[in-house]
Interface confidence: low
């Protein structure tokens, strides 16, 4: 099959970081700088992803891959091959479309991105709170008071937590 | 319509302790958060603390801590704020207000309509 | 623990504007709230999440916030307006107030 296509189509044999030029009657061609072509039998070579801005190089164009970027520190890559650049936050924060802003009571954020999310309820599980939460950190559940029998050392939730973080009660 | 009503006006000898109520009504009472503030003749608001019900979780100025409590009865939808060791500074109007926890950020959105608290010897 | 700073006071003329400050570190971070008091009565919202406007607060009102100040701005200053303005943010699980600003309509 391979060798009937060829006989076909004289464009199969051209390699990757080459393309079929047609106009020099279809012979190989290598891609021209700043282009490349990750498959054989192109027509055509694309042109290399420029990581300008806020991105940043990860990986350099070459004949037959595309350049990779991330993004310069302070920012978070997002979408298919870091097709956008997000502000990082700090832990217990959230981006917001005023910028980054804290993450308010009840809830906790422990990375750079992403949305603050609500403490766990442990009392949906039948348990209490061991550890309180903190913007930064979500809370601690442990065993229900009923699962500490009596005699048993019993577990005493620490007094609410007061570091600095985001609180609206 | 939601409604937070607080008990009435407080007169208390200094030393003593006051209990203060605020009943919700017209919202789901354990999905929010109940904050207590106070305001001095004259003066600005003062945030004391506050309680999610959901949690049971509640927290202080550092100000009242260890002299304010802050509870709430989720069954009755009421919080409750308990001040001891009261001196005649601790004359205020005193208001829970809701903080709405299901949107972000937090605001007080609804307040009761305060609670006058004298000490006086 | 975090600080609000607010000017004590201020006086407009009808029809002016007015600007309520609000100082504190790296403000920008937080969200602020503004709430309108008058004599007798208990506060209320008038500006949320820095510069949301909750229904029934007129145009004429806007907040913003950025570096270490947040802004409350009342264009067309009526009589009406008259009344003490605080600022609130939460830092931490504390909730902090500004000092409260007394706006006088001349």
């Known amino acids: 099959f391979e060798r009937t296509r060829s006989l076909q189509d004289p464009c199969s044999n051209c390699p990757a970081g080459t393309f079929c030029d047609n106009n020099r009657n279809q012979i190989c061609s290598p891609c021209p700088p700043n282009s490349f072509s990750s498959a054989g039998g192109q027509r055509t070579c694309d042109i290399c992803r420029q990581c300008k801005g806020v991105f940043r190089t990860r990986k350099e164009c070459s004949s037959t891959s595309n350049a990779e970027c991330d993004c310069t520190p302070g920012f978070h890559c997002l979408g298919a091959g870091c097709s956008m650049c997000e502000q990082d936050c700090k832990q217990g924060q959230e981006l917001t479309k005023k910028g980054c802003k804290d993450c308010c009571f009840g809830t906790f954020n422990d990375q750079k991105r992403g949305i603050c999310r609500p403490w766990t309820n442990c009392s949906l599980d039948g348990k209490s709170v061991l550890v309180n939460g903190t913007k930064e950190r979500d809370v601690v559940c442990g065993p229900s008071p009923a699962d500490l029998s009596p005699g048993a050392s019993s577990v005493t939730p620490p007094a609410p937590a007061r570091e600095p973080g985001h609180s609206p009660q | 319509q939601v409604q937070l009503v607080q008990s009435g006006a407080e007169v208390k000898k200094p030393g003593s302790s006051v209990k203060v109520s605020c009943k919700a009504s017209?919202?789901?009472?354990?999905?929010?958060?109940i904050s207590w503030v106070r305001q001095a003749p004259g003066q600005g608001l003062e945030w004391m603390g506050g309680i999610i019900p959901i949690f049971g979780t509640a927290n202080y100025a550092q100000k009242f801590q260890g002299r304010v409590t802050i509870t709430a009865d989720e069954s009755t939808s009421t919080a409750y704020m308990e001040l001891s060791s009261l001196r005649s500074e601790d004359t205020a109007v005193y208001y829970c207000a809701r903080v709405g926890r299901l949107e972000r950020p937090y605001y007080f959105d609804y307040w009761g309509q305060g609670t006058l608290v004298t000490v006086s010897s | 623990s975090y600080e609000l700073t607010q000017p004590p006071s201020l006086s407009v003329a009808p029809g002016k504007t007015a600007r309520i400050t609000c100082g504190g570190d790296?403000?920008?971070?937080?969200?602020v709230n503004w709430y309108q008091q008058k004599p007798g009565q208990a506060p209320l919202l008038v500006i949320s999440?820095?510069?949301d406007r909750p229904s029934g607060i007129p145009e004429r009102v806007s907040g913003s916030n950025s570096g270490n100040t947040a802004t409350l701005t009342i264009s067309t200053v009526e009589a009406g307006d008259e009344a003490d303005y605080y600022c609130?943010?939460?830092?931490?699980?504390?909730?902090?107030f500004g000092g409260g600003t007394q706006l006088t309509v001349l």
């Open positions: 609130q943010v939460w830092d931490g699980y504390v909730g902090v």
């Open positions: 790296n403000i920008r971070s937080k969200s």
């Open positions: 999440f820095d510069s």
């Open positions: 017209g919202g789901t009472f354990s999905s929010y958060a």
